[in-house]
């Protein structure tokens, strides 16, 4: 019996087609992805093949103005239109709190939403009861397939799930649910979830009875053969893990941003064992036409977005200096504003020991592309912020050793004076450079804001200590020459859309007046 699994993950509100790098589509003939194009390909496969499941491994939420405006209603609407069979909850599904998950998505989805390792307690237990499930049994042709969901246990550090959801260890939570499916005579089981490729592989290895793992969170691109675009494969598709009980378990993921549709064919024997598995992600490029009815629906929903981008978010009473003459040479108040917004967006998970889990921000000056003039009545709009941060990136959470941070700050000024983009703007950091010294030895003082303290203060950076830092995904991926970050990071979790982070902060503050205050000397 053959099953076709179509899968997406980390779509991050790319409802419209995008450019090859998943930013705003400029030249339509070279654009990719989007739900209208995805629908064309999905329908084509559904017509051609008998047993097809369309699955999503989480993080539909967050990433473009679509999410900012529609707050998840767009996800439910278009996933319903595409007729997804199931979805696993990702960490970003909690970005607007539990209410922001229940109202627009859980109440509106016409498909099951899954997570076995999220347990509700207190008043939330009854409120959310039945709206998401640990598993679902789906009939496919003449057979049944069990789908069990999981979500990153780091979600409380990455999003806003509140205090009434407990995120258990994935493997511990999955095993009893898989066992339950076995007692229901379900012998074909897919683990669908959002914890990253390393955890996906562990689930394949450790959870008895799981036949296939469909993952997300780490934006992993797997491919067999010559890759069709810029993404470099992290391994073959599917990636085969040998389980502890000796089975060959295929693990898949489909990069991110709706650029690819994962396509996996699995052959099962009559006892539900995987005999063979093969496939590849399908690049959703312009050779696949956009479905006209979905496209028309997208255009209808788009109207509200255009109105939103010119509305006032808040006011500035000072000039927001985002000029390259400032931000690539010295501390600039636009850099301070953005870093403050980045930290504010990550205020969560305080306890008796820690006032917050992260206090530091770094931001490449070259990523700041425009100033905002306060003389336009002080008004700040989404459109203004899109000029400052035009690349459609995210502000991510990484864990780095102090020694890596030191290298990053040396890199920041290794060729100072040439108006290059690697000069770092900061938050929660005080850095002093001596530019008379030779490159690679210019950082003379590097103090960082403590987190394990009741009164935050600046302490010297410790080389062997592990620090959490918020930074643009561009830097986490080694951009602007920050190879040491990419090579040495100990953990990387993708965060919220850059413009959204700053716009939320400005809306919260209402009036802003960031200063140059001696963070960089």
């Amino acid at each position: 019996w053959e099953l076709t699994i179509l899968h997406t993950n980390d779509v991050h509100s790319r409802l419209e087609q995008t450019s090859e790098d998943s930013s705003k589509c400029v030249n339509a003939s070279r654009c990719m992805g989007g739900v209208a194009r995805l629908f064309t390909k999905v329908q084509q496969i559904r017509r051609a093949e008998p047993n097809v499941l369309l699955l999503d491994a989480g993080d539909q939420y967050q990433g473009t103005i679509w999410f900012t405006v529609y707050k998840g209603a767009e996800v439910a609407h278009f996933m319903n239109a595409l007729r997804y069979d199931a979805m696993a909850l990702g960490n970003h599904e909690f970005d607007n709190g539990v209410e922001g998950l229940i109202e627009p998505l859980l109440k509106e989805a016409k498909f099951p939403i899954l997570s076995a390792n999220i347990k509700a307690k207190g008043p939330l237990a009854s409120q959310i009861s039945g709206l998401y499930l640990p598993y679902k049994v789906l009939p496919v042709g003449d057979e049944v397939v069990g789908i069990v969901g999981y979500t990153s246990k780091e979600t409380p550090f990455l999003s806003n799930p509140g205090t009434n959801l407990v995120f258990e260890d994935e493997i511990t939570a999955l095993q009893p649910e898989v066992d339950k499916l076995k007692t229901l005579n379900v012998n074909k089981i897919i683990a669908l979830g959002h914890s990253g490729f390393e955890t996906d592989k562990l689930i394949a290895q450790k959870v008895r009875g799981v036949d296939v793992v469909v993952g997300g969170h780490s934006n992993t691109f797997l491919y067999t053969g010559n890759p069709p675009s810029k993404e470099v494969p992290a391994g073959k598709y599917p990636f085969i893990v040998t389980s502890d009980d000796g089975r060959k378990v295929p693990v898949v993921q489909a990069y991110a941003f709706g650029k690819y549709l994962g396509y996996l064919k699995i052959e099962f024997d009559e006892r539900g064992n995987v005999i063979s598995s093969h496939g590849n992600p399908i690049l959703l490029n312009s050779s696949i036409p956009e479905d006209p009815s979905i496209k028309a629906d997208i255009n209808k929903w788009r109207i509200k977005l255009d109105n939103y981008s010119t509305q006032e978010l808040g006011k500035t009473i000072v000039y927001l200096d985002g000029s390259s003459q400032s931000c690539r040479f010295r501390e600039c108040n636009m850099g301070n504003l953005i870093c403050d917004a980045m930290i504010n967006n990550n205020l969560r998970h305080a306890d008796e020991m820690f006032w917050n889990h992260v206090s530091m921000c770094i931001l490449n000056g070259g990523g700041i592309r425009s100033p905002i003039d306060e003389r336009n009545n002080g008004t700040i709009t989404w459109e203004n912020l899109a000029a400052v941060l035009p690349f459609g990136g995210t502000f991510d959470l990484v864990q780095l050793k102090g020694s890596t941070l030191k290298k990053a700050f040396e890199h920041s000024v290794h060729r100072y004076g040439q108006s290059t983009g690697e000069f770092l703007q900061v938050g929660g950091i005080h850095v002093v450079y001596d530019l008379s010294r030779k490159p690679g030895d210019r950082v003379v003082k590097l103090d960082v804001l403590c987190t394990k303290c009741r009164v935050p203060s600046y302490d010297p950076l410790k080389m062997d200590e592990i620090y959490k830092v918020i930074l643009p995904n561009f830097l986490a991926n080694g951009g602007d020459g920050f190879q040491m970050i990419k090579d040495e990071l100990l953990r990387h979790d993708s965060g919220d859309q850059d413009i959204n982070v700053v716009s939320t902060y400005i809306s919260k503050m209402k009036v802003i007046y960031p200063a140059v205050e001696g963070r960089i000397k």
């Epitope: 319903n80 109440k107 016409k110 498909f111 009854s126 959310i128």
Partner: antibody
Amino acid sequence: QVQLVQSGAEVKKPGASVKVSCKASGYTFTSYWMHWVRQAPGQGLEWIGEINPSIGRTNYNEKFKSRVTLTRDTSTSTAYMELSSLRSEDTAVYYCARRVYGTMDYWGQGTLVTVSS
Amino acid sequence: DIQMTQSPSSLSASVGDRVTITCKASQDINSYLSWFQQKPGKSPKLLIYRANIWVDGVPSRFSGSGSGQDYTFTISSLQPEDIATYYCLQYDELYTFGQGTKVEIK
């Protein structure tokens, strides 16, 4: 367990209004939409409309839009359906039903509304 | 508005017979179709949604299939307790019920 308990039978004159209630228990009332459906004697089922109890948003069947009002009281976990300008063809059993995955899972026991002069 | 045409309007079959009811939508409804059972004097009961997904506790003799505009509900082996009227419901765009099929035992 989920229960939807509706108000008792009503007899109304043509031109009058009727308000039927549906009290939910066994789940959080505001977490699921509530549908209203009617069934004339010996006839099939006809969808009237639905309400999202948490925010009060409604969707109506075009046929009833001008005469029906769906409301809710979250403090008592009760949904209401009011139908005005009653005529004899409105004689029917009126049901509330909870929405899940877009469809209707749990139904109330029904309320017979008789319109007669 | 989406119209649903359900057939037959009634049928009579023997215990153990295979019974099939069809529903045709006036346009593609994306498999967003449910089947309900209503016994005399009772409220409808959801059996199947999304064209083919059973509700927990529903006997396996009930099944649904179909896609696009055409859907089928099957009782593989009719039992005395299956005497009822069966309705389809589309929920792709708002909601429309089929006219119903009354199932009787010969």
